[in-house]
């Protein structure tokens, strides 16, 4: 039921996460974990925020996006084989069993021989910043919403084909906003 | 040392209110997501409530959030449950226990407990 | 909601014995399980953790193991302060329900 992401051995890896703060500045805790998401906070965490900055992370593990705007997609740096897994993001909004909690999945292949000395474009950059989710309990498939510029037959099969990172660059080259949930 | 102490409980009319609390010693309470958990004599446990570190965040069981509200006072280092509405199905012992998840952890589970408090509804 | 069953309900065994109990859930709680030990009259104690890390104390006889929705508690050579009820509980959603319990009786 997890969404799927992948990356190749080396390169950097991008678990999209996003929330909308309630204000500019407004931030909610959120924590990213090793493993799917338990019924409180992350396990395994390896990056954790609080309502000013990141307050706790791990090497390799960082968030390239601006935070304070609610962008909290982890990067894992020069990714290896061990990185694969479920990973979950934790938007711990207060009040009453009101956390979102996201498991995504992370596949990583053996890094593709390329004889041409051609630059790859970093996974990270591949993927579209415009990516917004909404909450699901962790045995929940996560479903696509609202697409612009997209057409319906589209919609089915976009999960996967988000692993693809041609597509991803251009939905982002499209100005696609993408909604999941 | 862990100490968890609940306060007393007592006899309490049906479509009463009530509230219990539980003192914490021996550890730093704002660490701790905590926990109430209740017992009806001779029967098995049942999770209530639970609250994180900061009283910000709550859970509950759903037949009870309408009527029970957990919180705490990290500066008197105490957790409360406040019941109202109570039925005589709310008869229990209930206990405060801690949870042992740590921060950058990932570690689940009660590691300690109160020594319970007793709560009989009843006209 | 995620349903622990629990089995056996009772159990009696001697002491020196090795007893085992389980736990299924009725769905994927991903290792977020715990095991406690309760005696009569008093509260509840923390034996196991993430379904396997014993908790501080706890006597290495003592074991747990399982994934998934398939979770035991192990206890060897059991000694007398062993005998009480034993409760699993998850720790993967809301409710954190427990199992109904395994009492654990001297034969």
């Known amino acids: 039921s997890e969404v799927e992401y992948r990356a190749e051995v080396g390169q950097n890896a991008y678990l999209p996460c996003f929330y909308t703060p309630a204000a500019p500045g407004n931030l909610v805790p959120v924590c990213w974990g090793k493993g799917a998401c338990p019924v409180f906070e992350c396990g395994n965490v390896v990056l954790r925020t609080d309502e000013r900055d990141v307050n706790y992370w791990t090497s390799r593990y960082w968030l390239n996006g601006d935070f304070r705007k609610g962008d909290v997609s982890l990067t894992i740096e020069n990714v290896t084989l061990a990185d694969s897994g479920i990973y979950c993001c934790r938007i711990q909004i207060p009040g009453i069993m009101n956390d979102e909690k996201f498991n995504l999945k992370l596949v990583i292949k053996p890094a593709k021989v390329t004889p041409a000395p051609t630059r790859q474009r970093d996974f990270t950059a591949a993927f579209p910043r415009m990516l917004t989710t909404r909450g699901h309990g962790p045995a929940e498939t996560q479903t696509l919403g609202s697409l612009p510029d997209i057409n319906l037959t589209q919609i089915s099969t976009l999960a996967n084909e988000l692993r693809d990172s041609r597509l991803a660059n251009d939905l982002r080259d499209s100005g696609a906003t993408i909604r999941i949930g | 040392e862990v100490k968890l102490v609940e306060s007393e409980g007592g006899l309490v009319q049906p479509g009463s209110s009530m509230k219990i609390s539980c003192t914490a010693s021996?550890?730093?309470?704002?660490?701790?997501?905590m926990a109430w958990v209740r017992q009806v004599p001779e029967k098995g446990l049942e999770w209530v409530a639970n609250?994180?570190?900061?009283?910000?965040?709550?859970y509950y069981l759903d037949s009870l959030k309408s009527r029970f509200i957990i919180s705490r006072d990290n500066a008197k280092n105490i957790l409360y449950l406040q019941m109202s509405s109570l039925k005589s199905e709310d008869t229990a012992t209930y206990y405060c226990a801690r949870n042992i998840y740590y921060y950058g952890g990932s570690s689940y589970g009660m590691d300690y407990w109160g020594q319970g408090t007793s709560v009989t509804v009843s006209s | 909601d995620i349903q622990m069953t629990q089995s056996p309900a009772s159990l009696s065994a001697s002491v020196g014995e090795t007893v085992t109990i389980t736990c299924r859930a009725s769905?994927?709680?991903?290792?977020?399980l715990a095991w406690y030990q309760q005696k009569q009259g008093k509260s509840p104690q923390l034996l196991v953790y993430?379904?396997?890390t014993l908790a501080d104390g706890v006597p290495s006889r003592f074991s747990g193991s399982g994934s998934g929705t398939q979770y035991s508690l192990k206890i060897n050579s059991l000694q007398p302060e062993d005998f009480g009820t034993y409760y699993c509980q998850h720790f993967w959603s809301t409710p954190l329900t427990f199992g109904a319990g395994t009492k654990l009786e001297l034969k």
């Open positions: 021996g550890f730093t309470f704002s660490d701790y997501y």
């Open positions: 993430n379904a396997e």
């Open positions: 609250i994180n570190y900061d009283g910000s965040r709550t």
């Open positions: 769905g994927n709680i991903h290792n977020y």
